[in-house]
C-alpha cells in the first residue's frame, strides 16, 4: 500500500534494507560504510551546486529471527516483512535501496504499489527484468545472455572462426546468487539463449561433468560453468581434457585475474574466463579496506546507488521538480551517471552495462590476457589480442562440435 | 592545513614531453577531484583538464585532448600531468587545484603554479 | 562548450563603493558558477560557490547572486585590497569554463 515518503522540504531519505539474506556475505557493517561514504560525496556534489539540501540514510535492518539462513532461499518474505516495518513506521524514504535477492526484489516489487524507485545490487535473475521502477547496478543475467549468443555467432576473428550453436551448461545447485541466475537463464527453455541454440544440455552431478571431458560421444565442446579458478579445480582436478574442449568459467565480480602476480594454475589452459573491466578506486577508501577483491562489486554497487540518487535528486531539484512523483520513480534509466568508479551507464530499463572481458591462459606466459572485450550497452565485441597464444590448435578456437568443418 | 605543491615545469622544445606533479597534503586525497587550470602570461585561466577521487574519471579540455594524460596515486597523495607533443601556445604557468566535490566542482586550494615554457 | 562573458573586463570603483560585477553563461549552469579572485603573481582565491555561498574566510562584503545564466559578484564596500583580476566559473558538467576575468580598479 501507499506509504508517506520522508522526501519534501528540503529533507530527502534513502531507505536502505539491511537483509540479513543477502546476494553476497558481505558484512552489513561493510554496506553500511559504502553508503555513508556515498552520502558524504552526495552532500558535497549538493552544496557545491547551490542546493541547500539534507540528505540522510535510515538503515532499515530485520529482526533475524526467522530470516537467519544467509543467503537468498528465505529472503521472499523478509522484504516484504522490512516493507511492512517501513509502512508501520511511516519511515519510507525517497528511495528503496536493496534488496539484493531476486526472490525477495520480485515479490516485492509485485506486492507495492512502487511510486519511488527501487535500486538494487543484485537481483540477476530473469524475472527481475523489464521493471519499470527498479534499476539494477550490477550485471543482470540477460547481460551475461547476450554476450554468449554474440560470442557463439561471431565466426570473423582470426581466433574464432566457426559459429558455434551447442553448449553444455555446468549447475549442481550449489552456486552463488549471481551464478545460481546466470545459469538458471541459460538452463530456461524459453530465454533468449535457449532458442539462438541448436543443442543444450545442463549436466547437474560433478560425474556427468567430469565424463564429458574426455567423452568422443559429446555433443559439444563447449561447457559453460560460473565460478572462481578453484570451483574449477574442486570439480576437474587434474583430470586430462580432450584438445577441443573449450570451458567458458563466468566469473564477473572477481578482480584477481587482473593483480599482477597472479599466474593461471595448468589446469586454466582450457579455459576462458568472463569477468568485468577492473575498477582501480576502490583500494584506498575507507570503507573498502576490509574488502575482498570479490567483494568489492557489491558494496560499490551499494555506494553507486546513493551517487545516482543524488544525481537524480539534483537534477530533479535544479529544474524545481517535485520528487514523490511518478516521473521521479520512472527516471532511473537511459542516462550516465558519474559512479565512485567512473561514469556508470544505465539501459532503457534501469541496469547497469559494463564491459565484459574474456580472458585466456597464454601458454608462453602462464598469464591471464583479454582476448576480447564486450559492450553491453551497444551489444559489441571487441577484439584485443590477434595473435593468442592459446593452448587450442592453430591458436584458434575449436569448432563447437567435433569434425564438422568450416561453417 | 591544505598544500598544494606542484613541480616539473621547465623550458621544453616544440614537439617535446613533461611530466608535471602535485604533492597534496592536508586533506584526504582520494575524496576530492583535482584539476590542472593553466594560465599564459598575460591572459585570463583556462582548465585543462580534471580526475575524479577515484581516478575512474578523466576529463580534458579540446584543447589538449589526446596529447596530455591526466593521472593521481592516491597511495601517494600525488596527482599528475603528462603532456605530450607540446606547442609554442602550451606556455603557461600550470595550477593544481583542488576540487570541494569527488567530481566536478568548484576550486577551493590552489598551488602557486610551474611555469611551463615551450620555445625552440 | 558553455562559453562565460563577463559584462566588462575593467571596472573602475570608488573605495568605500558598491562594485557589481556580472557575467552571463552561453547557456543554462542552474547554481553551478563560482567566482574567483586573482591578484598579481599569486593563485586564484575561491570567493563564492554555488552562486551564492561564500567560501570559508571570506568577508561578508563579497556576496553573489543569480542563477541559470545571469549571475552577479558583489562587493559592498570596496576596499583597496580588493584591487585584482575576479574570474567566474562554472562547473555544470566536467568541462568547466572560465570568464576572461574582470579588472577591478580603484576609482
Known amino acids: 500500500s501507499q506509504v508517506s515518503q520522508n522526501c519534501h522540504n528540503g529533507s530527502y531519505e534513502i531507505s536502505v534494507l539491511m537483509m540479513g539474506n543477502s546476494a553476497f556475505a558481505e558484512p552489513l557493517k561493510n554496506l553500511e560504510d559504502a553508503v555513508n561514504e556515498g552520502l558524504e560525496i552526495v552532500r558535497g556534489r549538493l552544496q557545491n551546486a547551490g542546493l541547500n539540501v539534507t540528505v540522510n540514510a535510515t538503515f532499515m535492518y530485520s529482526d533475524g529471527l526467522i530470516h537467519n539462513s544467509g543467503d537468498c532461499r528465505s529472503s521472499t518474505c523478509e522484504g516484504l516483512d522490512l516493507l511492512r516495518k517501513i509502512s508501520n513506521a511511516q519511515r519510507m524514504g525517497c528511495v528503496l535501496i536493496g534488496p539484493s535477492c531476486t526472490y525477495s526484489t520480485f515479490q516485492m516489487y509485485l506486492d507495492t504499489e512502487l511510486s519511488y524507485p527501487m535500486i538494487s545490487a543484485g537481483s540477476f535473475g530473469l524475472s527481475c527484468d523489464y521493471k519499470e521502477t527498479l534499476t539494477r547496478l550490477m550485471s543482470p543475467a540477460r547481460k551475461l545472455m547476450y554476450f554468449l549468443v554474440n560470442f557463439w555467432k561471431t565466426n570473423d576473428l582470426p581466433f574464432k572462426t566457426y559459429s558455434w550453436s551447442t553448449s553444455y551448461v555446468y549447475k549442481n545447485g550449489t552456486e552463488t546468487e549471481d551464478c545460481f541466475w546466470y545459469l538458471n537463464a541459460l538452463e530456461a527453455s524459453v530465454s533468449y539463449f535457449s532458442h539462438e541454440l541448436g543443442f543444450k544440455v545442463v549436466l547437474r552431478q560433478d560425474k556427468e561433468f567430469q565424463d564429458i571431458l574426455m567423452d568422443h560421444n559429446r555433443k559439444s565442446n563447449v561447457i559453460i560453468m560460473c565460478g572462481g579458478p578453484e570451483f574449477l579445480y574442486k570439480l576437474k582436478g587434474d583430470r586430462a581434457v580432450a584438445e577441443d574442449i573449450v570451458i567458458i568459467l563466468v566469473d564477473l565480480f572477481n578482480d584477481q585475474y587482473f593483480e599482477d602476480n597472479v599466474t593461471a594454475p595448468d589446469y586454466m589452459k582450457n579455459v576462458l574466463v568472463l569477468t568485468l573491466s577492473p575498477g582501480n578506486s576502490l583500494l584506498n577508501s575507507s570503507f573498502s579496506r576490509n574488502l575482498s577483491p570479490t567483494k568489492r562489486d557489491f558494496a560499490l554497487a551499494y555506494l553507486n546507488g546513493i551517487l545516482l540518487f543524488g544525481h537524480m535528486l539534483k537534477i530533479f531539484l535544479e529544474n524545481g521538480e517535485n520528487i514523490t512523483t511518478p516521473k521521479f520513480a520512472h527516471a532511473f534509466r537511459n542516462l550516465t551517471f558519474e559512479g565512485y568508479d567512473g561514469p556508470v551507464t544505465l539501459d532503457d530499463w534501469g541496469d547497469v552495462d559494463s564491459t565484459m572481458v574474456l580472458l585466456y591462459t597464454s601458454v608462453d606466459t602462464k598469464k591471464y590476457k583479454v582476448l576480447l572485450t564486450y559492450d553491453t550497452h551497444v551489444n559489441k565485441t571487441y577484439p584485443v589480442d590477434m595473435s593468442p597464444t592459446f593452448t587450442w590448435k592453430n591458436s584458434k578456437l575449436p569448432n563447437d562440435i567435433t569434425g564438422r568443418g568450416p561453417q | 592545513e591544505v598544500q598544494l605543491l606542484e613541480s616539473g615545469g621547465g623550458l621544453v622544445q616544440p614537439g617535446g614531453s613533461l611530466r608535471l606533479s602535485c604533492a597534496a597534503s592536508g586533506f584526504t586525497f582520494s575524496r576530492y577531484a583535482m584539476n590542472w587550470v593553466r594560465q599564459a602570461p598575460g591572459k585570463g585561466l583556462e582548465w585543462v583538464s580534471g580526475?575524479?577521487?577515484?581516478?575512474?574519471?578523466?576529463y580534458y579540455a579540446d584543447s589538449v585532448k589526446g596529447r596530455f594524460t591526466i593521472s593521481r596515486d592516491n597511495s601517494k597523495n600525488t596527482l599528475y600531468l603528462q603532456m605530450n607533443s607540446l606547442r609554442a601556445e602550451d606556455t603557461a604557468v600550470y595550477y593544481c587545484?583542488?576540487?570541494?566535490?569527488?567530481?566536478?566542482?568548484?576550486?577551493?586550494?590552489w598551488g602557486q603554479g610551474t611555469l611551463v615554457t615551450v620555445s625552440s | 562548450e558553455i562559453v562565460m562573458t563577463p559584462s566588462s573586463a575593467t571596472l573602475s570603483v570608488s573605495p568605500g563603493e558598491r562594485a557589481t560585477l556580472s557575467c552571463r553563461a552561453s547557456?543554462?549552469?542552474?547554481?553551478?558558477l563560482a567566482w574567483y579572485q586573482q591578484k598579481p603573481g599569486q593563485a586564484p582565491r575561491l570567493l563564492i560557490y554555488g552562486a551564492s555561498t561564500r567560501a570559508t574566510g571570506i568577508p561578508a562584503r563579497f556576496s553573489g547572486s543569480g542563477s541559470g545564466t545571469e549571475f552577479t559578484l558583489t562587493i559592498s564596500s570596496l576596499q583597496s585590497e580588493d584591487v585584482a583580476v575576479y574570474y567566474c566559473?562554472?562547473?555544470?558538467?566536467?568541462?568547466?569554463?572560465f570568464g576572461q576575468g574582470t579588472k577591478l580598479e580603484i576609482k
Open positions: 566559473q562554472q562547473y555544470n558538467n566536467w568541462m568547466c569554463s
Open positions: 547557456q543554462s549552469v542552474s547554481r553551478s
Open positions: 587545484a583542488k576540487d570541494r566535490d569527488f567530481w566536478s566542482g568548484p576550486f577551493d586550494y
Open positions: 580526475i575524479s577521487g577515484s581516478g575512474g574519471s578523466t
